[in-house]
């Protein structure tokens, strides 16, 4: 039995970015018909993970897992169920807390992003890593890059693979 | 507001092992009063991640995130809620699907473990990685090591930090 997942293509792209493996990222992005500018934007984010070394990939993976398995995300599922007691209302949609984190990573200030991460993982090393990654992304990505990253996210969230 | 997490110390230990950073692992294990034999057992698992390189850490992180955010885990929360419509029944307990995966990693055969992973992430590269890690752990760990790893897991699951 293949279990239904919460937007698997999102996690595929996230871990491909964090991995620093261009081939893996290209494979994931092809699945959602990413344009060349969208790929360029994602590769700039990937560069930040690579430059920041292994620790950033592991710590950011930890943050993502913590948020994805938090009561905040679980609460979403529960809320839907309380409303109509049907499991299928869980959908395959990504949890709003994860969406918020990603939005803040792209469109929030470093302080705003780190504040969000701190709600889930307050370890100083985790927060410091989050700030370094965020500052790197802000330095590398132009307004246009960020628009392209956001349009790619729209494709991911609305993809049949989500 | 600090969000309640699902057994945060478990994820701390998991990512410390996958990271290959001994210091980070030692810090996490100290929090649950791990004995020397328990530390040795965890370091043998950590060695497998290190030997298998970066890709294994990223892919295993992806598997862990996918399981933790799957409907299987969500379903647990939902089930409890349907029973008494109280959010606090979510507890901070780790999701049974995650527990099952960890148990199979330690006590199952490679086929059994890979079969479990395949329910969540069927990418060939993920399954191949899972098999390599599992074979490595089986080769490195004695009966006694596995007993120690299991006793450490008990400490983690029953810790106030979970």
């Amino acid at each position: 039995v293949k279990m239904a997942e919460t937007c698997p293509i999102f996690y595929d792209v996230f871990f491909a970015v964090a991995n620093g493996n261009e081939l893996l990222l290209d494979l994931s992005l092809t699945k959602v018909n990413a344009t060349e500018p969208e790929r360029t934007a994602m590769k700039k984010i990937q560069d930040c993970y690579v430059e920041n070394g292994l620790i950033s990939r592991v710590l950011d993976g930890l943050v993502m897992t913590t948020i994805s398995s938090s009561k905040d995300c679980m609460g979403e599922a529960v809320q839907n169920t309380v409303e109509d007691l049907k499991l299928n209302t869980l959908g395959r949609e990504i949890c709003p807390a994860v969406k918020r984190g990603v939005d803040l990573f792209l469109t929030g200030t470093p302080d705003e992003y780190v504040e969000q991460v701190a709600q889930y993982k307050a370890l100083p090393v985790v927060l410091e890593n989050a700030r370094i990654l965020k500052n790197c992304v802000d330095a590398k990505m132009t307004e246009e890059d960020k628009e392209n990253a956001l349009s790619l996210l729209d494709k991911i969230y609305t993809s049949p693979l989500c | 507001v600090k969000m309640a997490e699902t057994c945060p110390i478990f994820y701390d230990v998991f990512f410390a092992v996958a990271n290959g950073n001994e210091l980070l692992l030692d810090l996490s294990l100290t929090k649950v009063n791990a004995t020397e034999p328990e530390r040795t057992a965890m370091k043998k698992i950590q060695d497998c991640y290190v030997e298998n390189g970066l890709i294994s850490r990223v892919l295993d992180g992806l598997v862990m995130t996918t399981i933790s955010s799957s409907k299987d885990c969500m379903g647990e929360a939902v089930q409890n809620t349907v029973e008494d419509l109280k959010l606090n029944t979510l507890g901070r307990e780790i999701c049974p699907a995650v527990k099952r995966g960890v148990d199979l990693f330690l006590t199952g055969t490679p086929d059994e473990y890979v079969e479990q992973v395949a329910q969540y992430k069927a990418l060939p590269v993920v399954l191949e990685n899972a098999r390599i890690l599992k074979n490595c752990v089986d080769a490195k760990m004695t009966e006694e090591d596995k007993e120690n790893a299991l006793s450490l897991l008990d400490k983690i699951y029953t810790s106030p930090l979970c």
């Epitope: 709003p96 969406k99 918020r100 939005d103 803040l104 792209l106 469109t107 929030g108 200030t109 470093p110 302080d111 705003e112 504040e115 969000q116 802000d138 990505m141 132009t142 307004e143 960020k146 628009e147 956001l150 349009s151 729209d154 | -």
Partner: antibody, heavy 119, light 107 residues
Framework: EVQLVESGGGLVKPGGSLRLSCAAS????????INWVRQAPGKGLEWVSL????????YYADSVKGRFTVSRDNAKNSLYLQMNSLRAEDTAVYYC????????????WGQGTTVTVSS | DIQVTQSPSPLSASVGDRVTITCRAS??????LAWYQQKPGRVPQLLIY???TLQSGVPSRFSGSGSGTDFTLTISSLQPEDVATYYC?????????FGQGTKLEIK
């Protein structure tokens, strides 16, 4: 041309409600965070609220928290500010302003709409 | 919340003068400070962001400096069209507080 146009201002009694709108054009609205900023007659600028492109995060100034609600409809390229329990001190010109993605500052402002709270 | 204090207000200077307006944050905000210009009866316009980066189209006589808690807006040679109220704003995180404004007049 990148443009923001506010509407919905007017005269309202204390305790009353009003809904302001901000229509956007010339840019991909759904990608941008938008602020509401107000300016009381003869006074300085006061930040009121911010809503992110996908509404995933929203911030309010303490002075309006619990009384004002910001929302957006990306399909209509529109932003809204629902103002309840209005007070005399809410009298001001209300501007919507786009926040840039790369530097987080307000680079495009609307012309403003006037709200007067008086009995 | 972080407070933002501007000085002086008001400010009177002659055409051609070098004019300096200061802005102080009650806590460090790195370089997350912007300056806006509002001419009488007009909408505010972004002048400077990231403490010292000039917004496209803004004359080069305007410059900004500072980091942490103390910031400065300088007009190297005041022009008649610079008559306006100038606001600093911290934007590292909400609330995005503005300074009280500095009204600049020509002597």
């Amino acid at each position: 041309e990148v443009q923001l146009v506010e509407s919905g201002g007017g005269l309202v009694k204390p305790g009353g409600s009003l809904r302001l709108s901000c229509a956007a054009s010339g840019f991909t609205f759904r990608n941008y965070n938008i602020n509401w900023v107000r300016q009381a007659p003869g006074k300085g600028l006061e930040w009121v609220s911010l809503i992110s492109g996908s509404s995933s995060y929203i911030y309010y100034a303490d002075s309006v928290k619990g009384r004002f609600t910001v929302s957006r409809d990306n399909a209509k390229n529109s932003l809204y500010l629902q103002m309840n329990s209005l007070r005399a001190e809410d009298t001001a010109v209300y501007y919507c302003a786009r926040r840039t993605l790369s530097y987080y500052v307000m680079d495009v402002w609307g012309q403003g709409t006037t709200v007067t709270v008086s009995s | 919340d972080i407070q933002v204090t501007q000085s002086p207000s008001p400010l009177s200077a002659s055409v051609g003068d070098r004019v300096t307006i200061t802005c102080r944050a009650s806590q460090g905000i790195s370089n997350y400070l912007a300056w806006y210009q509002q001419k009488p009866g007009r909408v505010p316009q972004l002048l400077i962001y990231a403490a010292s980066t000039l917004q496209s189209g803004v004359p080069s006589r305007f410059s900004g400096s500072g980091s942490g808690t103390d910031f400065t807006l300088t007009i190297s040679s005041l022009q008649p069209e610079d008559v306006a109220t100038y606001y600093c704003q911290k934007y590292n995180s909400a609330p995005y507080t503005f300074g009280q404004g500095t009204k600049l007049e020509i002597k």
